[in-house]
């Protein structure tokens, strides 16, 4: 605690500081999302969103942030993703976003308002001052896990999984030694917060990268482990090998081609 206190005074943490122009970026993204990307959300007041976001971490110790701190923001940014349209991902962020860029009716967390606002940003405040710390923020490994960014993603990931319904897809990286990683956000948060009374199937897409690769990665031991966890929760599990992710990129190059979406 004394180390935290000293560090808070010096504001020297092990991670990078708040992203430059953070308040402006949040407001700009909010306006773009609610007015252009998803006009159904145009009722959202972006100034209120920023105030609630700010309220979650400003003047608070950046190692003592709780999920409760983000509840006002979650309430304001509440959004319903249609059933069968949730795409989770683990170590396939770029590919998952290429997919939803083409298949516009499918949502990753970063395609929802709150995920869109915070994607790739860093932020933290300082204890007992209303300042935003642009110099450094706590690193999850070096400093503490209850930092503003980590707690935010854990909170919104939990909510995203809880609200999913129907068939949920997850895109996994077949090039990793552990295709399903229990320590990832998907493995530690999302898997355990899917609601069996709403979600009837989790379908894993194991993305291959190798040209000419024809292994069945759905037989990987970590996938069997995922199947066990999901089945124990009374959710049907399915796994598919996806061998040609380059098709995403080719479609993304010409997004104006509406035939590239899989409504055949």
């Amino acid at each position: 605690v004394s180390r935290w206190h000293q560090q808070s005074q010096r504001s020297q943490w092990g991670g990078r500081g708040t992203t430059d122009r953070f308040p402006e970026i949040i407001l700009e993204r909010c306006v773009e999302y609610t007015q252009t990307l998803l006009p159904e959300m145009r009722h959202v007041d972006c100034q209120n969103i920023w105030d609630a976001f700010k309220g979650a971490f400003i003047s608070k110790h950046p190692c003592k942030i709780t999920e409760e701190d983000y509840q006002p923001l979650l309430k304001l940014g509440n959004q319903t993703v249609p059933c069968n349209k949730t795409l989770l991902w683990s170590r396939t962020k770029h590919l998952a976003h290429q997919y939803t860029e083409i298949q516009r009716d499918v949502f990753t967390l970063e395609d929802t308002l709150l995920g869109y606002l915070a994607d790739d940003l860093t932020w933290c405040g300082e204890f007992e001052t209303s300042e935003i710390n642009y110099r450094s923020c706590p690193d999850w490994r070096k400093d503490c896990s209850s930092n503003p960014v980590s707690v935010f993603w854990k909170t919104v990931s939990r909510r995203f999984a809880e609200s999913a319904c129907g068939v949920v897809h997850v895109m996994l990286n077949g090039s990793c030694s552990n295709i399903f990683d229990k320590k990832s956000t998907f493995g530690s948060v999302e898997v355990h917060n899917l609601q069996p009374e709403k979600v009837h199937t989790l379908e894993a897409w194991v993305m291959h990268d190798g040209r000419g690769d024809s292994r069945d990665l759905c037989q990987d031991p970590s996938i069997k482990e995922l199947e066990l966890i999901i089945s124990k929760r009374n959710i049907t599990f399915s796994c598919k090998n996806i061998y040609r992710p380059d098709k995403f990129l080719q479609c993304a190059k010409t997004p104006e081609d509406s035939s590239c979406i899989s409504k055949i």
């Epitope: 997919y99 083409i102 298949q103 897409w205 291959h208 040209r211 000419g212 690769d213 024809s214 292994r215 069945d216 759905c218 037989q219 399915s238 796994c239 598919k240 090998n241 996806i242 061998y243 040609r244 380059d246 098709k247 995403f248 080719q250 479609c251 190059k253 010409t254 104006e256 081609d257 035939s259 590239c260 979406i261 899989s262 055949i264």
Partner: antibody, heavy 120, light 108 residues
Amino acid sequence: QVQLVESGGGLVQPGGSLRLSCAASGFTFSSYYMNWVRQAPGKGLEWVSGISGDPSNTYYADSVKGRFTISRDNSKNTLYLQMNSLRAEDTAVYYCARDLPLVYTGFAYWGQGTLVTVSS
Amino acid sequence: DIELTQPPSVSVAPGQTARISCSGDNLRHYYVYWYQQKPGQAPVLVIYGDSKRPSGIPERFSGSNSGNTATLTISGTQAEDEADYYCQTYTGGASLVFGGGTKLTVLG
């Protein structure tokens, strides 16, 4: 609407060569994998070859590897199959087929086919 | 390489349900596609991604895939459904395979 029109089939002697073409229209040609599938008289379907949209990746069935070459000209919206060292067992209707997008690898659209007969 | 096995023929009375199977090792780990082919015509995609129906395909066509077997189901079979049906899957690289085909006969 999507249209695929094959041409270039005909009668050829064993050991001979033939070049098939497939003219595509009604979609952004460069966004899709394209394929050749054949069907011998009275037999089932057999996938022959496939090519990615860009076209850096090409794939061949073992039965034609080293003899057939798939290529495409995205500026002309045309798919090709160069067939060399033809054998009697290559006699078939050859279909040009457009792949499904994204996670799916099946054939959404097919041409009407062009008949290749290898006989002396 | 996976091998897909289909029954050579299936017969069904009009209005009844026809089921055509397609089996292969761990087939559930791969998406399956079904094509209908009538004499002298090119194949037509009737099911993709195990169970999805392309636009324009009647609702009586459905598909499933579990274990080692995928199934094409035609409920309320009509005379016009008489055709050859092929299943297909892709197991990476140059392993794109079709089943041997099933001739569906609508009796009467």
